[in-house]
Amino acid sequence: IVLRPSRVHNSEENTMRALTLKDILNGTFSYKTFFPNWISGQEYLHQSADNNIVLYNIETGQSYTILSNRTMKSVNASNYGLSPDRQFVYLESDYSKLWRYSYTATYYIYDLSNGEFVRGNELPRPIQYLCWSPVGSKLAYVYQNNIYLKQRPGDPPFQITFNGRENKIFNGIPDWVYEEEMLATKYALWWSPNGKFLAYAEFNDTDIPVIAYSYYGDEQYPRTINIPYPKAGAKNPVVRIFIIDTTYPAYVGPQEVPVPAMIASSDYYFSWLTWVTDERVCLQWLKRVQNVSVLSICDFREDWQTWDCPKTQEHIEESRTGWAGGFFVSTPVFSYDAISYYKIFSDKDGYKHIHYIKDTVENAIQITSGKWEAINIFRVTQDSLFYSSNEFEEYPGRRNIYRISIGSYPPSKKCVTCHLRKERCQYYTASFSDYAKYYALVCYGPGIPISTLHDGRTDQEIKILEENKELENALKNIQLPKEEIKKLEVDEITLWYKMILPPQFDRSKKYPLLIQVYGGPCSQSVRSVFAVNWISYLASKEGMVIALVDGRGTAFQGDKLLYAVYRKLGVYEVEDQITAVRKFIEMGFIDEKRIAIWGWSYGGYVSSLALASGTGLFKCGIAVAPVSSWEYYASVYTERFMGLPTKDDNLEHYKNSTVMARAEYFRNVDYLLIHGTADDNVHFQNSAQIAKALVNAQVDFQAMWYSDQNHGLSGLSTNHLYTHMTHFLKQCFSLSD
């Protein structure tokens, strides 16, 4: 299936040009999306190109500026947040990145009624997290690991927690491992729907071993960065959940929410919190051995001012074939009765589907079914449930939005997006206004991305929010590569792949092949999305064929494929890449003497193992920031898939699956190893150990480190990295510079 054919015709050939590496590094062909910042059923805010904050009313068609760029500029604001009562706006400046989601910033409060900043009782700086209550204009914020509450922006703050301490106790914000591997947020506090209560997590990292690395900076002596970071098998953070009444915070103070007994009996995690009503909350817990999850619904007891979590309101989700959930355990979406909910989990055939739980999980009513997967529940209203899936035309790498009418019986299903712009748009997400009165669709490809606004009742398109016209025009004289998404059937396994082909691809010729791999559990690389990136350039200008393959362990194709790698990371992912390469060679247009593989992070691990597989298939390869031993990576992630590195659990496979154990096998390949020295995620230690093993085995290899760079290798390092990798590949493939 040709998804993005090159627009090359002989008559035009001389006016068309190939992509250059400069195009990619400059972001010349980047696209824009439009996500409305909904403030009601029919209104949204958007930051205009000239930096005014503009309110749009869909029904009147009117728009007006609520905050001028002058006000934004006066405090160098890069972000904003309107209070639900529309009285105030917080302005965020001095953004300072910490980890993947976390950052600190300075916050100013602007009074919209008076057109001036709130003076008196200003907020301290820098703040770790700040948010408005869902109703009114109360503020909760985290400063120096403690939580504070303001009834109004100009009021003095009420301090909720006092035990916060850097790297020891975290209140209302996650520690490193919870941020990266469990919550995927910068915050760990949650307002109840009407702002009566505030729930928060406390993480105690006192006993967690610390990763320490040098940050070289510009000073005479490097700084040492210390992060409590539990590696596989190490001591984990201890988590507790508290709830405080924000109307009378001093009355009884924070009340702890009890942990279900079956969870509390051994090491456990808190995985998410969902408010149902102001007096009902749902907590999800997970055993450290992550195949048992418990969803616990708790109620406020007015008489005792405590939270009660009856055993009858505990719902257990267990996996017998792998870990609980997909990448994370899914979260519930409650219906209007405030007790029943919709949730995605595996059905009896091993496909993730939407289920409706009214009393017990055993009696769950399956809402979707088939040999495909429901991926996300966007919104449940009185009469509709909106979700995304990869059902349409049986392509796992697509995402379409569906509506199920739950108000009628039997429920009817409609695909909202399947036929809208069928060639251009096959991968969607959505953003809904209050009560799903309106919604925005954001299409990511395979054509040029487009964002549109729709009526939530009729699904009619109201207007285009962003269609990337400039990008479309800029691409008119570019020879883009061709892309195709197809599948291989091998030994009862379906291997979906994306192949990126040079613009003048000719099946009768031979091309060098580059495999780009990620391959981590519950990931997906073969997606019908638009991208003009480094591999597009390699195909367009350098005439390479690039392939991405989703093997065992990848997502959205059922549990058989997903859980195949359970407790055996580093085996089948590599095997499936190798199998695919052999199949590509059989297609007849691959030069089998010029095959390379590269990957980043988990992909660096897989590419390293593939290079060291001893197959002789690969001439060369690159590993960027690879994991080299699962003993070096984070407990929450690693143990989910590998169990514990103990003799009575899975230590043997932890030892067998290292890159170092295969050092000898790198002798006959050209290997480029790359890592940032300030990688907080996959520590430089991983590459240091690979390098040491290769040196000890007297195996030659190439390496590049990026001083003071983290796992993302951003800024000028990005340019250097891709330039360096390009030279390496061109040399490997004997392509002239």
Epitope: S40, N57, T60, K437
Partner: nanobody, 115 residues
Framework: QVQLQESGGGLVQAGGSLRLSCVAS???????MGWYRQVPGKQREWVAG???????MYTESVKGRFTISRDNAENTVFLQMNNLKSEDTAVYYC??????????WGQGTQVTVSS
């Protein structure tokens, strides 16, 4: 630019009621509108808001006593004020909710609650 004309203020005993009206020239149709008030020498404060779909919101101190409503056909927004207290004494304004920038305010209407 929307022109706004407030009316209905007056002198009233504590515990009494008043109904304020705000007529917008040009169409407000289903735009969100709000009532605001200002005591001399103090900051203007928001009192109540109503969206096009008639979702209402109130500042804590007037909840249960004030009711905001609208008549789109007449381009009018109302504020029914019951059980008035002396601290409700102020000049009352209506405007877009939130106000636009640059902001346009009407003359307002004076509400005085005597005890």
């Amino acid at each position: 630019q929307v022109q706004l004309q407030e009316s209905g203020g007056g002198l009233v005993q504590a515990g009494g009621s008043l109904r304020l009206s705000c007529v917008a020239s040009g169409t407000i149709s289903s735009g969100a509108m709000g009532w605001y008030r200002q005591v001399p020498g103090k900051q203007r404060e928001w009192v109540a808001g109503i969206t096009g779909s008639r979702t209402t919101m109130y500042t804590e101190s007037v909840k249960g006593r004030f009711t905001i409503s609208r008549d789109n056909a007449e381009n009018t927004v109302f504020l029914q004020m019951n059980n008035l207290k002396s601290e409700d004494t102020a000049v009352y304004y209506c405007n877009l909710w939130p106000p636009s920038r640059p902001d346009y305010w009407g003359q307002g209407t004076q509400v005085t609650v005597s005890s």
